[in-house]
């Protein structure tokens, strides 16, 4: 028997200094966790006690945090690379700066193979492209071979910017010719990396032939067994074995996201390669472990250009941006208009012409809007700015609701209206109207939304058992703020990018902002 | 306006030093590598080395490893290359240039170039 | 180290000439490659960069292509001002850089 060591990462979205324990800024050291150097301590320390060992990440290392705003991916290239992965399969996010922001920054930096066999490239690009990502590579750990195959979210055009000469292929049809090639070339362990999620995991576990372990990402799926050390609670038992079409039990992992933990997976293999054991679980990277000395001081190095970036302008206002709670928990404010209008503008993606745009709508709780921006400052926007309209660190995510789902957040909305409460909606591409007179639960009287198959958009009734993608906050698709029928009726769900990113995009493209209120959100008494 | 002005460059008798600067402006040197690039008399250009702009990639062509150390001083937007073991076949002009994309751990292309500074080897 | 390899040496052409230069790489260089012009007692200037980018303030009448082992520099229509030395210069992953030997334009 053969004995190999799987260490792995998913979604670290630009996580490269130590978080708190909800990912979020660290504030208080001793109780921070994650972090590249952190992780490295671990990594090295299991290295050094274990003789065949992999670190494999599964995408999204783009997207987060101020350090991906600032330093467009050539952070992630560094860092990997300072920490010796072996592979990484490349995530949605990766192709958020188009494709020119993976291959300079990233593509061409990486000293590790970066991997997706689903992804065609075709044009001019492929040429370009050719040799800069692999469908598979064969790494040799002590003194056998493993291959390594990548595949990517199908949804990526509707997720990202990669542009029209990529092409996204089922990820089942892709790999299975490649999971072939490995086996004609006499490599009899195979491990899918890849960024599509737990379901999309246990399929490709399930119907790909010579798969013998999954390791995923993009749903930030957190498996344990036991009891887990942190809040995550856990989706299944790490590892996860999926019983395949062939007869065979193949373990699939994720490591929840964020950096918080590295995945740790101990495979057995027999003298054919066949799975025989499989154990393990995340390693929760608390302040227990001590971050690396050398790489926390490359950390601080680059960290001196974020303080400068966060000061610099972005654009104007000539506007007050009204981000008060008297405001924005009670009616429509213009901050939240912005915001929204920044939501939207960021997931322009033309990939059907029977749609001017795959989404049209967006809705924000007000609570999470936490400052308003004086025009009064020169009109000066800065990130610093911004970072107090929106400082949890969250993400605008794409999801699926049905039109009932959406009139029962509305109703949520206002159906404790006029206590300064943050459930209040803030929208994009949505027209509202509240009778407040009517009992909570019943006061929608209203509810049209802009039309996305349409050439020319314009505001139609909502409709109860239609599927539409709306742009949100991650806590309202986690059901925070009290919005638990989001969280339970969601079609899908697909993370996206940092709020503060989003808006400062935005802002930056446009250079002068006057949003206003303009009628979205409006209240009335009496009949309809 | 991006401006790279090198100095230090003379003539110097073989086996001895000699160490030239670039002094940058106009544009933010921190984020970017620095290189230096040399052409003998009548000849074509020789990459001589290359700096990333953390300093942590440091390059050298293989005709001057171990004699030749380059180096930045971010504080005082400043490139340094310090030349020991003069040989004749060092005699050139040396450019002082910029890399192109911020940010990067390896080396691009130069998009800005100083005007050069010669320095011969003779005895 | 990847060797670079440009022809002619010396090309003599005229005025409104469309003319073309070939640097070949001894082994794959994706499209990281760049073209430079020189003339005599200044300093080189950057062209075009990533085989076929234009240079910000290069005339159009620039152009590069090519990827992996050939790439060419063409000048649509050769203007007065072009007469120089033309040097191409590879980029690749984590290798030295190196440059083609030059290729001299003049008068015909």
């Known amino acids: 028997a053969w004995e190999l060591t799987i260490l792995h990462t998913n979604d670290v979205h630009s996580r490269l200094e130590q978080t708190s324990e909800d990912s979020s800024k660290c504030v208080n050291a001793s109780r921070c966790m994650g972090g590249v150097a952190r992780l490295f301590t671990k990594v090295q320390q299991i290295r050094r006690a274990e003789p065949n060992v992999l670190l494999l990440d599964a995408g999204d290392q783009y997207q987060g945090t101020i350090w991906f705003t600032v330093y467009k991916g050539a952070e992630v290239a560094h860092f990997m690379n300072a920490l010796r992965y072996d592979a990484m399969a490349l995530g949605n996010h990766e192709f958020d700066n188009g494709v020119e922001g993976l291959i300079e920054p990233l593509l061409k930096e990486a000293k590790f193979p970066i991997l997706s066999a689903n992804i065609k490239a075709k044009g001019p690009l492929a040429s370009q492209i050719s040799g800069l990502y692999l469908p598979y590579k064969v790494l040799p750990v002590g003194d056998e071979v493993v291959g390594i195959v990548g595949y990517t979210s199908k949804e990526t055009p509707f997720l990202s910017n990669p542009g029209t000469n990529l092409v996204f292929e089922d990820e089942i049809t892709a790999l299975q010719p490649e999971v072939d090639k490995l086996k004609t070339l006499n490599v009899n362990k195979i491990i899918a990396l890849g960024h599509s999620g737990f379901e999309m995991d246990k399929l490709i576990a399930q119907k790909v032939r010579g798969v013998d372990v999954v390791v995923g990402g993009h749903s930030n799926t957190f498996l344990y067994t036991g009891n887990p050390p942190s809040k995550e609670v856990p989706a299944g038992k790490y590892p996860f074995i999926v019983t395949s079409d062939d007869g065979r039990k193949v373990p699939v992992v994720q490591a929840y996201a964020f950096g918080k933990y590295l995945g740790y997976l101990k495979i057995e293999f027999d003298e054919r390669g066949n799975v025989i054991s499989s154990h393990g679980n995340p390693i929760l990277l608390n302040s227990s472990i001590p971050e690396d000395p050398s790489i926390k001081a490359d950390i601080n190095k680059w960290r001196i250009k974020l303080d400068n970036y966060s000061t610099q302008e972005l654009g104007k206002t000539i506007v007050y941006l009204d981000g008060s709670s008297q405001s924005c928990r009670f009616r429509e404010c213009n901050m939240g208009n912005l915001i929204c209008d920044a939501m939207i503008n960021n997931n322009l993606r033309h990939t059907d012409e029977m749609f001017w745009n795959h989404v049209s709508m967006c809705i924000l709780n007000g609570g999470g809007i936490r400052s308003p921006i004086d025009e009064r400052n020169n009109g000066t926007i800065t990130w610093e700015n911004l970072a107090a309209v929106l400082p949890f660190g969250g993400t605008f995510d794409l999801v699926q609701l049905k039109g009932s789902t959406l009139k029962k957040a509305f109703e949520h909305s206002v159906h404790r209206y006029g206590q300064s409460t943050g459930e209040f909606l803030q929208v994009g591409g949505i027209h509202v109207v509240y009778d407040l007179s009517r009992k909570p639960g019943d006061r929608v009287v209203k509810l049209d939304v802009l039309c996305t198959k349409c050439r020319v958009p314009s505001y139609d009734p909502l409709k109860m058992d239609e599927v539409y993608k709306v742009i949100l906050p991650n806590f309202l698709a986690n059901g925070g703020d009290g919005f638990q029928m989001i969280k339970d009726e969601l079609l899908r769900h697909d993370s996206g990018d940092q709020d503060i990113n989003v808006v400062s995009t935005y802002i930056s493209k446009m250079k002068v902002i006057y949003p206003a209120v303009e009628g979205r959100i409006k209240f009335s008494t009496g009949s309809h | 306006e991006v401006q790279l002005v090198e100095s230090g460059g003379g003539l110097v008798q073989p086996g001895r030093s000699l160490r030239l600067s670039c002094a940058a402006s106009?544009?933010?040197?921190?984020?970017?590598?620095m290189h230096w690039v040399r052409q003998a008399p009548g000849k074509g250009l020789e990459w001589v080395s290359g700096?990333?702009?953390?300093?942590?990639?440091?390059g050298y062509a293989d005709s001057v490893k171990g004699r030749f150390t380059i180096s930045r001083d971010n504080a005082k937007n400043s490139l340094y290359l310090q030349m020991n073991s003069l040989r004749a076949e060092d005699t050139a002009f040396y450019y002082c240039a910029k890399d192109g994309p911020r940010y990067r751990g390896s080396y691009y292309y130069f998009d800005y170039w100083g005007q050069g500074t010669l320095v011969t080897v003779s005895s | 180290d990847i060797q670079m390899t440009q022809s002619p040496s010396t090309l003599s052409a005229s005025v409104g000439d469309r003319v073309t230069i070939t640097c070949r790489a001894s082994?794959?260089?994706?499209?990281?490659l760049a073209w430079y012009q020189q003339k005599p007692g200044k300093a080189p200037k950057l062209l075009i960069y990533k085989a076929s980018s234009l240079e910000s303030g290069v005339p159009s009448r620039f152009s590069g292509s090519g990827s992996g082992t050939e790439f060419t520099l063409t000048i649509s229509s050769l203007q007065p001002d072009d007469f120089a030395t033309y040097y191409c210069q590879q980029y690749n992953s984590y290798s030295p850089i190196t440059f083609g030997q030059g290729t001299r334009l003049e008068i015909k």
């Open positions: 106009g544009f933010s040197f921190d984020d970017y590598a």
């Open positions: 082994q794959s260089i994706s499209n990281w």
């Open positions: 700096i990333s702009w953390h300093s942590d990639n440091i």
